[in-house]
Interface confidence: low
């Protein structure tokens, strides 16, 4: 029997991703969407997406239970995407559970989104 793992998102104010209009601002940082609720299984792959846009382009960091996420070759990685950043965990284990937070900053402002993997 598969053990279910799901991600529940902390709701935060969002706005639609409208780069064209946002780029007219001198500086901005927007959380475009909170982390989505997902359900997956042990041994499978989970992806957490930090969907932000900004000018200048934001720097995004990942935290698990308030500590920086440490990448593991071929298993746990994060990288920049079109929408911000993606954290991918392969071969899920029960030890992967916890609170995941992405923090984005453009040097002036900070936005964050938190999800729970359990």
């Amino acid at each position: 029997q598969e053990t279910e793992l799901s991600v529940s998102a902390e709701l935060v104010p969002t706005s639609s991703w409208n780069i064209s209009s946002e780029l007219n601002k001198d500086s901005y940082l927007t959380l475009d969407e909170p982390m989505n609720n997902i359900t997956t299984s042990l041994g499978q792959t989970a992806e957490l997406h930090c969907k932000v846009s900004g000018n200048p382009p934001p720097t995004i960091r990942w935290f698990k239970n308030d500590a920086p996420v440490v990448q593991e070759p071929r298993r746990l990685s994060f990288r920049s995407t079109i929408y911000g950043s993606r954290l991918r965990i392969r071969n899920l284990d029960t030890t992967d559970t916890g609170y995941f937070q992405c923090v984005a900053t453009n040097g002036k402002e900070v936005v964050s989104s938190t999800g729970v993997l359990f």
Partner: antibody, heavy 114, light 107 residues
Framework: QVQLVQSGAEVKKPGASVKVSCKAS????????MHWVRQAPGQGLEWMGW????????KFNHKFDGRVTMTRDTSTSTVYMELSSLRSEDTAVYYC???????WGQGTMVTVSS | DIQMTQSPSSLSASVGDRVTITCQAS??????LIWFQQKPGKAPKSLIY???SLANGVPSRFSGSGSGTDFTLTISSLQPEDFATYYC?????????FGPGTKVDIK
């Protein structure tokens, strides 16, 4: 592994509509944007828009406003792109691609001819 | 819309050559640029993200540089499997726009 499997080739008359499907497996459909890109024979790539299957939100290239519709069926992990009022210049291979263009479907050839 | 131009439109090279392809945006796009490789009859494959970051599984002979309006894709030592068409894509502003492509063929 991640796979995007598209529906088969279509031949349509000018003025008709075509609906292309893209079935996803190996990843969570609802947490990834799905883009549609087309390529006319011997030509370059053209972005048509995206759908976010988690909530059905869409964003289109204004060139296609009013002619393109993107929908999803999360129960079958399938996304659809429908293009209406077809004309000969819509003859192209239509591709679906997820999120940051990591994975692509094999393409669907749509031929518009009278 | 942001216009993307590429040069050259085509080039002939030999295995082992160093190949450089440039992409220019009509306005500042920061580092919001992807490079793709496409072979005949196949879907494009991503090579470089955020102008300089190598995609998973892509050989290290591929590299990207640039920011703002001018970008470069370099293949340090061309291999037989690298003969293809290369496209850049900007995702700084909607609509996302591709460059017209650069075809790399055998000399």
């Amino acid at each position: 592994q991640v796979q995007l499997v598209q529906s088969g080739a279509e031949v349509k008359k000018p003025g008709a509509s075509v609906k292309v499907s893209c079935k996803a497996s190996g990843y969570t459909l609802t947490t990834n944007y799905m883009h549609w890109v087309r390529q006319a024979p011997g030509q370059g790539l053209e972005w048509m828009g995206w759908i976010y299957p988690g909530n059905g939100n869409t964003k289109f290239n204004h060139k296609f406003d009013g002619r393109v519709t993107m929908t999803r069926d999360t129960s079958t992990s399938t996304v659809y792109m429908e293009l209406s009022s077809l004309r000969s210049e819509d003859t192209a291979v239509y591709y679906c691609a997820i999120s940051d263009f990591d994975y692509w479907g094999q393409g669907t050839m749509v031929t518009v001819s009278s | 819309d942001i216009q993307m131009t590429q040069s050259p439109s085509s080039l002939s090279a030999s295995v082992g050559d160093r190949v450089t392809i440039t992409c220019q945006a009509s306005q500042d796009i920061g580092n919001n640029l992807i490079w793709f490789q496409q072979k005949p009859g196949k879907a494009p494959k991503s090579l470089i993200y955020f102008a300089t970051s190598l995609a998973n599984g892509v050989p290290s002979r591929f590299s990207g540089s640039g920011s703002g309006t001018d970008f470069t894709l370099t293949i340090s030592s061309l291999q037989p499997e690298d003969f293809a068409t290369y496209y850049c894509l900007q995702y700084r502003e909607y609509p996302l726009t591709f460059g017209p492509g650069t075809k790399v063929d055998i000399k």
